[in-house]
């Protein structure tokens, strides 16, 4: 168990724990104090004791010892009084820290005393050696507990230069692979640096005498170190491994390292000392095996095999941990260690080896674990697990502390929990005690809640309630109890409505540049704070102040100016403080493809065959498969900025060989196309020019035609520049009269035409036009027939007759003309005709002529749309390219037809049962008018009750209809007639119904002169005629309000003029109908001095 921080009010004791101790190995130098450290924590206060070499050691009783008087410290310091005092205190120390709960133990601290380093007195003989031989200068420094550093110097304290030939070994000896006369010195001094004592001592100088020789003899390598052929060594896991090979020989050997048993771990291996030393960092099990050094020179080699065994000091797999336990629990301390060789594990309890304890103890040791069952407070102890092998020792202290604590609920009482329907609520009841208290949850009735399978308890006391329902709202009680006491808390649960997205956003596919709207509707519990937010690919979306990319409002997300980067998943997040629901939609942005990113030309050698290979990288398809790629070219010389398509290839292709034209400066580009259209084109390719070649095409549309009677103009469609196949092109034109088989005349021209002069009129010629450039001629051209210039035709068409088809159409026929008289290609016939006048009366108006062009192979024409009852003049002419020939003439007349519609039919209401119809005759009589036909019927009777009668007077302009119903509307139809029958009708609708009743003066106004006033109005179409009075009344004192006698006026009149008025006078005008006042207006006459005439065209009565 672990006592929670919130569990207050219980002062728990603590077993001893070592917090600080001296290192396992302590080397003391002559002038140093000895400090042995041992500190520990614990409640009650810890007592310390020491052992040396397993025997009780009392620091306080030793001379020169200072013990630190500190509650958590058992450390002490020994101060010496002479240089070798430390020798007396050498040994293995251990510290024990105890209180009433147990004893903790430090690791073994090995104290070693190091004396002042001295080189044993020796006489160093000179070393004599012949040039080229090898030599070893020994160093043999005194032994040291701490690593030391060796340097070789001369008496001037200059380092001896080391290289492949001269090397210091790890042992400090100086090795010469071969000596040179320049090595001859009497002061090779080995210096040993002891960092612990901060002293450097030096060996007696060695005198190296090198005898010169005239013949240095080459010899193969031999190892100076190690001297035997193989050696075995142990490397410690995690430590560095250093292997060394030093060889002699002449020339100087080089050293190589091999690992026959596997690969050399390059990341951890370094070679030093001119390859003589191999250092392997952080040795691991896999480094076990053979390492071989090879010394080579031109005469041979020598080798040494190192057989490395990797071993390891003990290390933890599972270190025992201190724990608190409640009564009755089982305590298990795991002590799993590894090492090579396998370490031996021993257990201690409170510092005493278990072997020395009484046999009736309740612990058992099983597979590296110390186990105590059913622990009680009296079983509290500190255990030690110690593992050792020949490479080291490992120690762990771990306590078993058995405590008794009353039950306590650490969760606050009377907490309110809120959760939504369908979710899971968690009611907390964190309880603690020793033994661990049992926890029960009860409802308001004191019944256990666990009868409902939706309620489930957790080991930590929490009660879970899944699939929450509204009626789960209420109070719940948590009861915690152990053998010392029991406690209760209450929890309130409120179940709210779950948030629901009633209509989420829908997945959609949209075009780039368009906008998309996602909508989201949700329902929330009314007591909770609602929120709707939007996420795009997991990122929160917000309207950005400086951009109108996103618009968010009322559950709507609008994304403007869609780009491909906007593609992704968009979700509406509806949330309250209790729950979050999310509805997701996918947005795919589609559009035309992206640009082709890269374009490369290859097989440029094919340019000589007018081909090249184009390859490109695929374009982004923007969610619509690429259907095709369009390959285009531009010629910057001939047509800059103009792109021509060379063809399209399927969308799964990314290269093609193109067929090109000679001498074109090709720059290519490729565009991807999908169903949304073409993308941006690729970057342009480099420009390549195809070699020149003779033309492969000749001009088309070759024609020969004269533009004068004595010439022939040969024309053709010039070759497009891309067909020139060279920088320029010319045209070889050949011609000869047709059928002569004589020689061709020819001329080479640059323009797309040639004028052949002095030709006879309308002679056929054979013509050929061939393209020519600097590389040669085009293919053999085709022969075209052309003609020299035409003259006006001399042929007159002979008329065969005119057939009258009806009153407005005739058929004209003529005989084909003699082609010899045409003087050119007969293009057809011009037929011209015009109306000379009606048969009724001849008009003097301007004559309008109509033309019909008839093809050469046709000798008749129907002239339609003629006016009936009219005289026409007709001319027919043959025509060729030059113009028209003489005309044949003829006159004909069209028979009578039916007339056009009468003009302007007006309805004038006479009473509520009678109407006056007023009209004008038709514009086109098309014959002799014989009268009119009038028909009418009520509109709402669907055409029943039609009345029709003939008005036989062609001069008639009005007709009065009586006995009409005042309640009906009628349809009136009036037709004029000739002997051919009635013509087109004019139609009006109306009746007396809407037109009688209250009179309407419409737009009425008055104007005045000096002595008169004109009142005018616009009569309403069909308004029944009526009579009314107009009264002029003068205003002002001197006028005395004098009135003129009222005048009777007819409505159809449209205006009335009142004379005999006073100048410069205001008048009121009153309008009466059947003594009822209908309208009033005012007018003022002008002052004197004006012409006293009324305006022209005004009627007076």
């Amino acid at each position: 168990i672990q006592i929670p921080e919130e569990y207050e009010g219980h002062h728990v004791m603590e077993p001893p724990v070592i917090t600080e101790q001296s290192p396992r190995r302590l080397v003391v130098f002559p002038t140093d104090d000895i400090s042995l450290k041992c500190e520990a924590s614990g409640k009650p206060e810890v007592q310390f004791r020491w052992t040396r070499d397993g025997v009780h050691f009392k620091p306080k009783e030793e001379l020169g010892v200072t013990v630190y008087q500190s509650p958590h410290s058992g450390s002490f310091t020994i101060t010496g009084n002479n240089s070798n005092f430390a020798q007396r205190f050498q040994g293995i120390y251990r510290c024990f820290a105890s209180n009433k709960l147990g004893t903790a133990m430090s690791h073994e601290i090995r104290l070693m005393a190091e004396g002042a380093p001295k080189w044993p007195k020796e006489t160093v003989k000179p070393v004599e050696v012949e040039e080229g031989e090898s030599v070893v200068l020994p160093c043999n420094p005194p032994p040291s507990a701490e690593p030391l550093r060796i340097y070789w110097m001369n008496s001037k304290i200059l380092h001896i230069k080391q290289d492949e030939r001269v090397t210091m070994g790890q042992n400090g000896n100086l090795y010469f692979a071969n000596v040179l006369t320049s090595d001859n010195h009497s002061d090779y001094i080995c210096h040993a640096h002891f960092p612990g004592t901060r002293t450097i001592i030096q060996k007696e100088p060695i005198d190296l005498r090198v005898k010169a020789t005239n013949s240095m003899i080459d010899r193969k390598p031999r190892l100076l170190f190690p001297t035997n052929s193989s050696s075995h060594l142990v490397a410690l896991q995690g430590q560095p491994l250093v292997l060394e090979c030093i060889a002699e020989g002449f020339p100087t050997p080089t050293i190589k390292w091999l690992r026959p048993s596997g690969p050399m771990p390059a990341d951890r291996v370094t070679y030093q000392n001119h390859n003589k030393t191999l250092q392997l960092l952080k040795v691991g099990e896999e480094d076990d095996g053979e390492y071989r050094c090879l010394a080579e020179n031109s005469l041979g080699s020598a080798r040494h095999a190192y057989y490395v065994t990797v071993e390891a000091a003990p290390y933890w797999l599972h270190k025992p941990q201190s724990h608190l336990y409640g009564p009755g629990e089982t305590a298990r301390l795991d002590c799993q260690v590894q090492g090579r060789p396998q370490p031996e594990v021993t257990w201690r309890i409170n510092g005493i080896p278990v072997e020395e304890l009484a046999k009736d103890q309740k612990y058992r040791i099983q597979r590296g674990a110390l186990i105590l069952s059913n622990v009680q407070p009296s079983d509290t102890m500190v255990t030690q697990c110690e593992a050792r092998n020949r490479h080291g020792l490992l120690l762990a202290n771990a306590y078993i502390y058995v405590v008794q604590l009353p039950a306590k609920i650490l969760t606050a009482d009377n907490q309110t929990y809120m959760a939504v329907q369908g979710s899971t609520a968690y009611l907390l009841c964190k309880a603690f005690g020793a033994p661990v208290p049992s926890v029960q949850w009860l409802d308001e009735d004191g019944t256990t809640v666990l009868q409902d399978e939706r309620f489930f308890p957790y080991a930590n006391g929490t009660l879970g309630i899944r699939d929450l329902q509204a009626n789960d709202t209420g109070r719940y009680f948590c009861l915690a109890a152990n053998d010392q006491n029991n406690v209760t808390i209450m929890a309130n649960l409120k179940v709210k409505d779950a948030t629901q997205i009633t209509q989420g956003p829908r997945s959609t596919i949209e075009k780039k540049g368009s906008r998309v709207t996602f909508t989201c509707q949700a329902s929330f519990d009314p007591s909770l704070q609602p929120s709707i937010t939007w996420r795009g690919d997991g990122r929160d979306l917000q309207e950005l102040g400086d951009s109108d990319k996103y618009f968010i409002e009322d559950g709507r997300l609008v994304i403007h100016s869609l780009d491909y980067s906007d593609q992704g998943n968009y979700s509406c997040v509806a949330s309250t403080e209790l729950d979050v629901v999310e509805s997701r939609a996918q947005l795919l942005v589609v559009g035309s493809p992206g640009p082709v990113p890269r374009l490369v030309l290859s097989d440029l050698h094919l340019l000589t065959q007018s081909q090249v290979r184009v390859s490109w990288s695929p374009a982004e398809d923007h969610n619509a498969p690429i259907e095709k790629y369009d390959i285009e070219f531009e010629d910057k010389e001939m047509a800059p900025e103009k792109w021509y398509s060379l063809g399209k290839v399927p969308g799964n292709q990314t290269s093609t060989t193109l067929k090109l034209s000679p001498y074109v400066h090709y720059t290519f580009r490729v565009t991807a196309i999908n169903k949304y259209g073409p993308g941006e084109p690729s970057p342009v390719s480099e420009t390549v020019v195809t070699p020149e070649a003779a033309p492969e095409k000749n001009p088309v549309d070759v024609k020969g035609e004269g533009n004068e009677t004595t010439n022939m103009v040969i024309t053709w469609k010039p070759l497009r520049w891309m067909d020139w196949n060279a920088p320029q092109v010319q045209y070889r034109v050949q011609w000869r009269p047709q059928g002569t088989r004589g020689p061709w005349q020819e001329q080479i021209v640059s323009d797309p035409f040639l004028v052949v002069s002095n030709t006879s009129t309308f002679v056929p010629y054979e013509i050929k036009v061939q393209a020519v450039n600097s590389q040669g001629k085009g293919p053999e051209p085709q022969v075209t027939i052309g003609y020299s210039g035409e003259d006006y035709p001399q042929a007159i068409p002979e008329l065969e007759g005119i057939e009258i088809l009806n009153s407005s159409a005739v058929l004209v026929k003529w005989r084909p003309v003699d082609l010899a008289q045409v003087k050119g290609h007969l293009r057809g016939y011009n037929v011209t005709y015009w109306r000379e006048g009606s048969q009724r009366k001849h008009s003097k108006r301007h004559i309008h002529k109509d033309h019909v062009v008839v093809p050469a192979n046709t000798t008749s024409v129907i002239l339609s749309g003629l006016r009936p009852y009219s005289s026409y003049h007709l001319e027919v002419q043959a025509f060729n390219g030059r113009g028209s020939g003489p005309a044949s003439e003829f006159t004909f007349s069209t028979p009578e037809g039916v007339p056009g519609h009468p003009e302007a039919l007006h309805l004038e209401c006479q009473s509520n049962t009678s109407l006056l119809l007023r009209w004008q005759p038709p514009l086109s009589h098309n014959g002799v008018l014989t009268g009119y036909v009038l028909s009418y019927h009520p509109l709402d009777e669907g055409g029943k009750g039609q009345l029709s009668f003939n008005l036989r007077d062609p001069e008639l302009r009005t007709h009065n209809l009586t006995d009409l119903s005042p309640h009906l509307r009628y349809r009136f139809q009036l037709q004029a007639t000739t002997k051919e029958g009635p013509g087109e009708a004019i139609v009006r609708e109306g009746g007396t119904m809407a037109l009688s009743g209250i009179s309407d003066f419409g737009n009425i106004s008055a104007t005045a002169g000096e002595n008169y006033s004109v009142v005018s109005w616009v009569p309403k179409e069909g308004q029944c005629n009526f009579r009314f009075h107009i009264l002029f009344k003068a205003l002002g004192e001197e006028k005395g309000g004098a009135s003129l006698s009222p005048q009777y006026v007819s409505y159809n009149q449209s205006s009335y003029t009142q004379w005999d008025l006073q100048p410069d006078t205001d008048y009121e005008i009153h309008l009466f109908k059947e003594r009822m006042f209908r309208h009033q207006m005012a007018v003022k006459t002008n002052g004197t001095g004006r012409v006293r005439l009324p305006p022209a065209g005004f009627a007076t009565e």
Partner: antibody, heavy 119, light 107 residues
Framework: QVQLVQSGAEVKKPGSSVKVSCKAS????????IQWVRQAPGQGLEWIGY????????DYNQKFQGRVTLTADKSTSTAYMELSSLRSEDTAVYYC????????????WGQGTTVTVSS | DIQMTQSPSSLSASVGDRVTITCRAS??????VAWYQQKPGKVPKLLIY???TLHSGVPSRFSGSGSGTDFTLTISSLQPEDVATYYC?????????FGGGTKVEIK
């Protein structure tokens, strides 16, 4: 007359970068692609890459991909070649050359820039 | 990449001699081969393209021939000013590659 003038000699440390310039005159800079070629001491010619000064589109010899960057400045009619992660074998004379209008040939050359890479 | 192998790597001839340099491509390059002349301390200069077409301003004593994989540059009458190194170049495919060069000296 057509001229391509390159920047002066450079001495660089291994691992560093060098940027060589090539100023064009006497023709319309954007109408012709600029190619880069190098020549190691006593060795032959090696093509590095090209740039279209009109669109700045460039392509490189795969051997130099990732180490070479070709750029151009229309306003000064200058092309640039930058080579990074220099090694001793990059010691060479670097030439810019104008690509002939219709074929990948070199009709006008810069005077060359010597780049020495040495620690 | 297309390898261009030139031979000989150097030659020595007398003024007026006919000199022939050959260039072999590792694959068919049609006639997409050019020849350059580089005089000591100078920049290369285009002599021939399309294997045999003389570049403007190049003396007529220079000629080229060949197609496919084997190409030849011929100097019909060696002049002192022709002392230079000559390079062939293929432009059929990228990367553009050059021959190793042939150094021509006067005896």
């Amino acid at each position: 007359q057509v001229q391509l003038v390159q920047s002066g000699a450079e001495v660089k440390k291994p691992g560093s970068s060098v940027k060589v310039s090539c100023k064009a005159s006497g023709y319309t800079f954007t109408n012709y692609w600029i190619q880069w070629v190098r020549q190691a001491p006593g060795q032959g010619l090696e093509w590095i890459g090209y740039i279209n000064p009109s669109t700045y589109y460039s392509d490189y010899n795969q051997k130099f991909q990732g180490r070479v960057t070709l750029t151009a400045d229309k306003s000064t009619s200058t092309a640039y070649m930058e080579l990074s992660s220099l090694r001793s074998e990059d010691t060479a004379v670097y030439y810019c050359a104008r690509r002939q209008f219709g074929l990948p040939l070199f009709d006008y050359w810069g005077q060359g820039t010597t780049v020495t890479v040495s620690s | 990449d297309i390898q261009m192998t030139q031979s000989p790597s150097s030659l020595s001839a007398s003024v007026g001699d006919r000199v022939t340099i050959t260039c072999r491509a590792s694959q068919d390059v049609g006639t997409a081969v050019a020849w350059y002349q580089q005089k000591p301390g100078k920049v290369p200069k285009l002599l021939i393209y399309w294997a045999s077409t003389l570049h403007s301003g190049v003396p007529s004593r220079f000629s080229g021939s060949g197609s496919g994989t084997d190409f030849t540059l011929t100097i019909s009458s060696l002049q002192p000013e022709d002392v230079a190194t000559y390079y062939c170049q293929q432009y059929s495919n990228y990367p553009l590659t050059f021959g190793g060069g042939t150094k021509v000296e006067i005896k």
